[in-house]
């Protein structure tokens, strides 16, 4: 399974997507601040087989498409870019599914490591109640919208790990 | 890796203005935050405000509000604190500041060497 | 606004010396306080954010505490180049502003 140069394209285009879908200033929302407990040690990528990283990756791809794809976020931010977003993401997450089927063949895919699965889950169950919370209020959609920039730039820099891999 | 570099030291007339600019480097430019903090001769730091320049609006201390002008130009990576009215307090070495990219303005890791901008008639 | 106050303004030490500098808001700023050290005709460099973690590069002889409305900066062992001026500044909310700043002089 190679990751190749266009799957790096494709997470830089989502990265820069998330930054132009910012629709009030980040200097604004400070005292929204939140600590959502991203959970690093599964993007570190040592401890990892390829195929696990991967299905990781996986994760935290689809409940950002899910996280996104909700109609209080569709409320929140401008349509055209979602769509694109949308389609990018996409995009990875059949690079990613290709390439766990490729690592480790159809059959042992639904077993890879449910804990690293389970704690981006949970992550992202945070990150849900936190906006529940604060009823979807543009300060706290910015405080998600740039903490999954964040926890994307961890895949982003997971993805390049296993790229050098190969 | 990051460099802010500055420009030149000004010398200017009360009431006339100044403008300052601030090219970076390293990074994506547009999605992180570029703050201006001055320091008066002997004296601490004061936050002017901030810009992130993918979102193009300025965010402004009370104190310069009307004053300053906070801009950013993506094409040059190119950020510029313009300061109106100028007085005789405004005497100051002015930096700017870079904020942590993908992470929300609070900290200023990384700052330009700083612009002396007198003001004396 | 929200106002920072250190103390002391100036102290006097010696390589080797324990230093403490300590930083008060006027109101709960939670954790958000960042450590600054200054020297003469430089910028600013981070030290300390959140107020207790370590900004990388930075030696462990550098410390942070704190929460709420009271935070100290402590440098364990005072080396010669520590000599400067330190400053606080809250992040909690803006306008973003710091302390007046402690001059660390040599003995």
């Known amino acids: 399974c190679n990751l190749s140069q266009t799957h790096s394209l494709n997470n830089r285009r989502t990265l820069m997507l998330m930054a132009q879908m910012r629709r009030i200033s980040p200097f604004s929302c400070l005292k929204d601040r939140h600590d959502f407990e991203f959970p690093q040690e599964e993007f570190d990528g040592n401890q990892f087989q390829k195929a696990q990283a991967i299905s990781v990756l996986h994760e935290m791809m689809q409940q950002t498409f899910n996280l996104f794809s909700t109609k209080n976020s569709s409320a929140a931010w401008d349509e055209t870019l979602l769509e694109k977003f949308y389609i990018e993401l996409f995009q990875q997450m059949n690079d990613l599914e290709a390439c766990v089927i490729q690592e480790v063949g159809v059959e042992e895919t639904p077993l890879m490591n449910e804990d690293s699965i389970l704690a981006v889950k949970k992550y992202f169950q945070r990150i849900t109640l936190y906006l529940m919370e604060k009823k979807y209020s543009p300060c706290a959609w910015e405080v998600v919208r740039a903490e999954i920039m964040r926890s994307l730039s961890f895949s982003t820099n997971l993805q390049k790990r296993l790229r050098r891999k190969d | 890796q990051v460099q802010l570099v500055q420009s030149g030291a000004e010398v200017k007339k009360p009431g006339s203005s100044v403008k300052v600019s601030c090219k970076a480097s390293?990074?994506?430019?547009?999605?992180?935050?570029i703050s201006w903090v001055r320091q008066a001769p002997g004296q601490g730091l004061e936050w002017m405000g901030g810009?992130?320049?993918?979102?193009?609006?300025?965010n402004y201390a009370q104190k310069f509000q009307g004053r300053v002008t906070i801009t950013a130009d993506e094409s040059t990576s190119t950020a510029y604190m313009e300061l109106s009215s100028l007085r005789s307090e405004d005497t100051a070495v002015y930096y700017c500041?870079?904020?942590?990219?993908?992470?929300?303005?609070?900290?200023?890791?990384?700052w330009g060497q700083g612009t002396l901008v007198t003001v004396s008639s | 606004d929200i106002q920072m106050t250190q103390s002391p303004s100036s102290l006097s030490a010696s390589v080797g010396d324990r230093v403490t500098i300590t930083c008060r808001a006027s109101?709960?700023?939670?954790?958000?306080l960042n450590w600054y050290q200054q020297k003469p005709g430089k910028a600013p460099k981070l030290l300390i954010y959140?107020?207790?973690s370590l900004q990388s590069g930075v030696p462990s002889r550098f410390s942070g505490s704190g929460s709420g409305t009271d935070f100290t900066l402590t440098i364990s062992s005072l080396q010669p180049e520590d000599f400067a001026t330190y400053y606080c500044?809250?992040?909690?909310?803006?306008?973003?502003?710091f302390g007046q700043g402690t001059k660390v002089e040599i003995k």
């Open positions: 500041a870079r904020h942590l990219e993908y992470a929300f303005p609070d900290k200023f890791d990384y």
């Open positions: 390293g990074g994506t430019f547009s999605s992180y935050a």
């Open positions: 810009i992130i320049p993918i979102f193009g609006t300025a």
């Open positions: 109101q709960s700023i939670s954790s958000y």
């Open positions: 959140f107020a207790s």
């Open positions: 500044q809250q992040s909690y909310s803006t306008p973003l502003t």
